[in-house]
Structure formats: structure tokens, C-alpha cells
Interface confidence: low
């Protein structure tokens, strides 16, 4: 199979829909693309392959099987344990004994009750690995106008690339920086007058894997004087700061 | 590398039959499907129709039912496109094109083109 | 059958400079999945058709990134941000939404 990567590193190979042993005149069930599956592998721990069931014209229970291509686990597998939408089929879970990161992960989508109409896709799993979000930030003085930041992740620190952002009571945005495998930040202008912010997120890239999509954030820590009665900005930002993906 | 290499160029009467061969190599024959495309001089590109090497199915514009017909041999890895009862608004350079199975649907890889001229 | 209409019909454009084209069709190609089936695609002097543009926006493998597409519903438009002389051709827009798939019919791209 000549295979030609998409811009997220993904082969995406799927069933064309609009071949039918009998002519279509009319745009047909049997016609329609099957939706587009996506999956995530979490921390390593178990993967979500999801796809749209509402945009099946007719509610449909989709099937999934999966394998890796030329290797030792290219057997077909059945999905042993869907997830649902309103009752209907949307996605499968795999668990960890199923992951296989470096090997070519083929996915199969299927319409049982028109078995010609099915799509399959291959992905390069290392570059759908999502962490978890960096937990147990703690915040330090190391000197009087110097903090450091540090966190864990429950994963192989090599493998990860990490985000911080931080920003004070009077900032109208987050200040960023990328601090690449380390898992400490220091700031070394601290104003004693300030409240200061901090959130983390982590990545799986690039000595691992190459993902593009970021863990969720951390937990805020926080640092300072509370001035927040002074200053709308600090309640906007603890109100909305899960939307910040 | 992908490769579709279609037969060479045909000149033929009006009434007669053609069939244009298009072989592939390069990649896994049944896993793709091959779509035949019509340019006459002058016109815009016309979709025939396409197959499924690995079930047979067909799929035909309107306009071309009862003129082509599509059949693939996986033995072989070609496909081949049949004109019937040429007429002189036949003639044009016929396309197989092979169509990538990414969520993206397009024709990724073309023929060189056949050109069938029909004159009397 | 859905119709796609091009323009202009012919585009001389200086190198170095952005060219860009038109591609309309006579019904909505958002299909019922939220996708939108719209391909462009270059025919150089002499050549078979080549692939650009997938699904609106998306550059095919090889593509240089001065190519891009854009657009929805019924309007779409490929710019080549700084022409270069390799790209003279014919540039067709095409819709495989619905079936029969139908193709514009050409913008001529040539080097003033």
C-alpha cells in the first residue's frame, strides 16, 4: 500500500463512498462517507477512538475492528467495549495491553447493515498521545524577588515537553513559556505587591512521539498578595480558565 | 512509486467499440478506487464513473450509462474503461485517475491520458 | 446535476505576485457530514491533471505552501501567493460531494 502522510503525520486510507454494486442515481445511504474516526491515546493508559454518530443519516449502531499492519498483532480484533451516544454506537476503548505506540494502528469502520460501506485508517499512534495534565504544582521562594515553579507528570519526563503560563492581577493575558523537557520554571523578577497565577500543560513530543495536541491544563497555583477585590481581571480569568485549551 | 499506465492512442470509426486498459503498480490495487475522466478539446473535465476493484462496484454519472463501462482485472492490477457505439463527440483524451481513500476524497494519482479519436 | 463556475476564464499575473481564482457552485457541496468535498487541481502545458487542494483547504503531499484554498457552502477561492513561471496551467476546481462529480471549467494561468 503506497501511503502518503497527512499534515498530522496520519495515514487516513477509507472506503470510497460512492461505489455500489448497483447504479445510484439518488444519493443514497449506501452512497454516504462514514464518519471520520479520531483517537487519542491517554498517558499511555488507554486510547478513545470517537467519531460523530450524528451524522449518520439514520441512527446506526457503526462497528469497529482494528489491527497493526505488518507486524505480530495483525489479527483482526473486535471492539470489545463501545461507547455510546443516546444509545447508539460513537467510539471504542482500547486498554493498555492493546496500545501498540510504534507500530502502524489500523482502524475499521463499518455499517453492519450494508457491509460494503466501510472506512479504514491508519495512524501512527506515537503522535496521538495525550498526558495527562502536569499535577502537584508547588510554587517556591528561592530568593527574594525569585519563584520557582515545579510539577510531576505521571510519564516518562524525557518523552515530555512542557508549557507555562503565568500572569499577575493587573495582566490582561497570559505571559508564556515553553520550557522544553525541564519540569521547573523560575521567574525572577517577582513584585511583592502582585498576585501571580500559574498554570502548566504538557506534550508528548518530540523525542517520543509527534502530537500536536497539548494535555489539558493543571490546576492554578498561586502566589501574592490577593488584590482580586481590586481588579476584575483575576475573577474572569479563575472563571474561565478551563476554556483555555 | 504510484504509477497508472494507461494504453496507447486509438483511432476509430464511428459505431465501433474501444476498451482503454490503465495499469497500476506501485501500491495495493484493491485497496483504492479507479475513476475515468473525460477531456474533450475545449470542454471541461467530465467524471465517467468509478470502481471498486475489490467488490466490483460501480458507480457511473448519468450521462455516461449505456457509453462506458467499467471493469477492473486484480489479477493484473488494471482497470478498463469500454466505449460503445463511438460517435464523433467521443473523441478526447480519456483519464483513469486513482482515488485516495483519505477522508480528503480526491483523485491523487492520474493516467497519462488516451486519446481516442473517432472519425470517419 | 451541480454546475461549478470559474473565473476569470484567463489570469496573466507578473511573477512574484498573487493570483487568485474563483470557484462557485449552483447548490451548497457541505455535505451531510459536516465536510466539504471541494478539490482544486493544476493541468500543466502537455500534462495530465494534478492534484492541489483537498477538502477546501488541505494541501496535498508535495504542495508548495504559496498554494491555498479557502471558502465554504457554495464559495471557494485557491490564491498562489507569489506566482512562480513552473506554475502556468490550467487550474480546475471540482466538487466529489454529490454524485456525478463535476469540475469547473478552467482558469488559464499564464506569465505576463
Known amino acids: 500500500l503506497n501511503t502518503i502522510l497527512t499534515p498530522n503525520g496520519n495515514e487516513d486510507t477509507t472506503a470510497d463512498f460512492f461505489l455500489t454494486s448497483m447504479p445510484t442515481d439518488s444519493f443514497s445511504v449506501s452512497t454516504l462517507p462514514l464518519p471520520e474516526v479520531q483517537c487519542f491515546v491517554f498517558n499511555v493508559e488507554y486510547m478513545n477512538c470517537t467519531w460523530n454518530s450524528s451524522s449518520e443519516p439514520q441512527p446506526t449502531n457503526l462497528t469497529l475492528h482494528y489491527w497493526y499492519k505488518n507486524s505480530d498483532n495483525d489479527k483482526v480484533q473486535k471492539c470489545s467495549h463501545y461507547l455510546f451516544a443516546e444509545e447508539i454506537t460513537s467510539g471504542c476503548q482500547l486498554q493498555k495491553k492493546e496500545i501498540h505506540l510504534y507500530q502502524t494502528f489500523v482502524v475499521q469502520l463499518q455499517d453492519p447493515r450494508e457491509p460494503r460501506r466501510q472506512a479504514t485508517q491508519m495512524l501512527k499512534l506515537q503522535n496521538l498521545v495525550i498526558p495527562w495534565a502536569p499535577e502537584n504544582l508547588t510554587l517556591r521562594k528561592l530568593s527574594e524577588s525569585q519563584l520557582e515553579l515545579n510539577w510531576n507528570n505521571r510519564f516518562l519526563n524525557h518523552c515530555l515537553e512542557h508549557l507555562v503560563q503565568y500572569r499577575t492581577d493587573w495582566d490582561h493575558t497570559w505571559t508564556e513559556q515553553s520550557v522544553g523537557h525541564s519540569h521547573s520554571f523560575s521567574l525572577p523578577s517577582v513584585d511583592g505587591q502582585k498576585h501571580y497565577t500559574f498554570r502548566v500543560r504538557s506534550r508528548f513530543n518530540p523525542l517520543c512521539g509527534s502530537t500536536q495536541h497539548w494535555s489539558e491544563w493543571s490546576h492554578l497555583i498561586h502566589w501574592g498578595s490577593n488584590t482580586s477585590k481590586e481588579n476584575p481581571f483575576l475573577f474572569a480569568l479563575e472563571a474561565h480558565h478551563h476554556h483555555h485549551h | 512509486q504510484v504509477q497508472l499506465v494507461q494504453s496507447g492512442a486509438e483511432v476509430l470509426k464511428p459505431g465501433a467499440s474501444v476498451k482503454v486498459s490503465c495499469k497500476a503498480s506501485?501500491?495495493?490495487?484493491?485497496?483504492?478506487?479507479m475513476h475515468w475522466v473525460k477531456q474533450a478539446r475545449g470542454q471541461r473535465l467530465e467524471w465517467i464513473g468509478g470502481?471498486?476493484?475489490?467488490?466490483?462496484?460501480?458507480t457511473y454519472n448519468q450521462k455516461f450509462k449505456g457509453k462506458a463501462t467499467l471493469t477492473t482485472d486484480t489479477s493484473t492490477s488494471t482497470a478498463y474503461m469500454e466505449l460503445r457505439n463511438l460517435r464523433s463527440d467521443d473523441t478526447a483524451v480519456y483519464y483513469c485517475?486513482?482515488?485516495?481513500?483519505?477522508?480528503?476524497?480526491?483523485?491523487?494519482?492520474w493516467g497519462q491520458g488516451t486519446l481516442v479519436t473517432v472519425s470517419s | 446535476d451541480i454546475v461549478m463556475t470559474q473565473s476569470p476564464l484567463s489570469l496573466p499575473v507578473t511573477p512574484g505576485e498573487q493570483a487568485s481564482i474563483s470557484c462557485r457552485s449552483s447548490q451548497s457541496i457541505v455535505h451531510s457530514n459536516g465536510n466539504t468535498y471541494l478539490e482544486w487541481y493544476l493541468q500543466k502545458p502537455g500534462q495530465s491533471p494534478q492534484l492541489l487542494i483537498y477538502k477546501v483547504s488541505n494541501r496535498f503531499s508535495g504542495v508548495p505552501d504559496r498554494f491555498s484554498g479557502s471558502g465554504s457552502g457554495t464559495d471557494f477561492t485557491l490564491k498562489i501567493s507569489r506566482v512562480e513561471a513552473e506554475d502556468v496551467g490550467v487550474y480546475f476546481c471540482?466538487?466529489?460531494?454529490?454524485?456525478?462529480?463535476?469540475f469547473g471549467s478552467g482558469t488559464k494561468l499564464e506569465i505576463k
Open positions: 506501485g501500491y495495493t490495487f484493491t485497496e483504492y478506487t
Open positions: 485517475a486513482r482515488r485516495r481513500r483519505y477522508y480528503g476524497y480526491a483523485l491523487d494519482y
Open positions: 471540482s466538487q466529489s460531494t454529490h454524485v456525478p462529480f463535476m
Open positions: 470502481i471498486d476493484p475489490n467488490t466490483g462496484g460501480v
